[in-house]
């Protein structure tokens, strides 16, 4: 994964400072409060399973 300040994360992912890597925006459905979700331009996450 890219370091901050270099090439952006690939489409559908966003940089997580907490985890120090690019993370899948799809994970924001389960974990909407993750730091990287702020960088995900998708629609608001659907309600999660639990």
């Amino acid at each position: 994964e890219q370091a901050p300040g270099t090439a952006p994360c690939s489409r559908g992912s966003s940089w997580s400072a907490d985890l120090d890597k690019c993370m899948d925006c799809a994970a924001c459905r389960a974990r909407p409060h993750s730091d990287f979700c702020l960088g995900c331009a998708a629609a608001p996450p659907a309600p999660f399973r639990l």
Partner: antibody
Framework: QVQLQQSGGGLVQPGGSMKLSCIAS????????MSWVRQSPEKGLEWVAE??????????HYAESVKGKFTISRDDSKSRFFLQMNNLRAEDTGIYYC??????????WGQGTDLTVSS | DIVMTQTPASLAVSLGQRATISCRAS??????????MHWYQQKPGQPPKLLIK???SLESGVPARFSGSGSGTDFTLNIHPVEEDDTATYYC?????????FGGGTKLEIK
């Protein structure tokens, strides 16, 4: 590099107990959800239990088949987690894998440990 | 629980040809944006290895010969061209809800 090192397993009699352990290294353990997945010829791959992170209040979830029998726990200070299995039956026999997931897919896996429940 | 049905149970493909494995979920595992379906490869004596996440996203380090597609209830894993090292059992898994469930597996043999 990422590693999940498992211990525990072996032969146990029906009705007996066993505790499995998994020690993690190489990733931010405290941020990840941890699961146990088992595999047998009869049932294939079967998710067993999950424990979430501190930010998710260490919520736990279990497969119906093990509810009330198995307990998952974690120790973030030592990057390890556990599966306490009680009242074991023959159908609990299989290879048990520890695995980590941030949210959806099982990213990292332990090497697997065999559990045999037999008299 | 969501039931994952994989077909075929076994498959023999000639070296360099295409292998196609299907997985059907008993209900939709997709939103308008993402599909919560993942694919793994397992070789004897080893744990499963993640190949494809969210239906079509290739895991880092996995060769581009592997690809995934599909949405809703029907998903496909393609391997092209197959290599000898691809001999393994392949599994799909959903993460739409708890319990997470896996397909029964597809054993791939290279001819």
């Amino acid at each position: 590099q990422v590693q999940l090192q498992q211990s525990g397993g072996g032969l146990v009699q029906p009705g007996g107990s066993m505790k499995l352990s998994c020690i993690a290294s190489g990733f931010t353990f405290s941020s990840y959800w941890m699961s146990w997945v088992r595999q047998s010829p009869e049932k294939g791959l079967e998710w067993v239990a999950e424990i979430r992170s501190k930010s998710d209040n260490y919520a736990t979830h279990y497969a119906e088949s093990v509810k009330g029998k198995f307990t998952i726990s974690r120790d973030d200070s030592k990057s390890r987690f556990f599966l306490q299995m009680n009242n074991l039956r023959a159908e609990d026999t299989g290879i048990y894998y520890c695995s980590s997931t941030y949210a959806d897919y099982f990213h990292y896996w332990g090497q697997g440990t065999d559990l045999t429940v037999s008299s | 629980d969501i039931v994952m049905t994989q077909t075929p149970a076994s498959l023999a493909v000639s070296l360099g040809q295409r292998a196609t494995i299907s997985c059907r979920a008993s209900q939709s595992v997709s939103t308008s944006t993402y599909s919560y379906m993942h694919w793994y490869q397992q070789k004897p004596g080893q744990p499963p290895k993640l190949l494809i996440k969210y239906a079509s996203s290739l895991e880092s380090g996995v060769p581009a010969r592997f690809s995934g597609s599909g949405s809703g209830t029907d998903f496909t894993l393609n391997i092209h061209p197959v290599e000898e090292d691809d001999t393994a059992t392949y599994y799909c898994q959903h993460s739409w809800e708890i319990p997470y469930t896996f397909g029964g597996g597809t054993k791939l043999e290279i001819k």
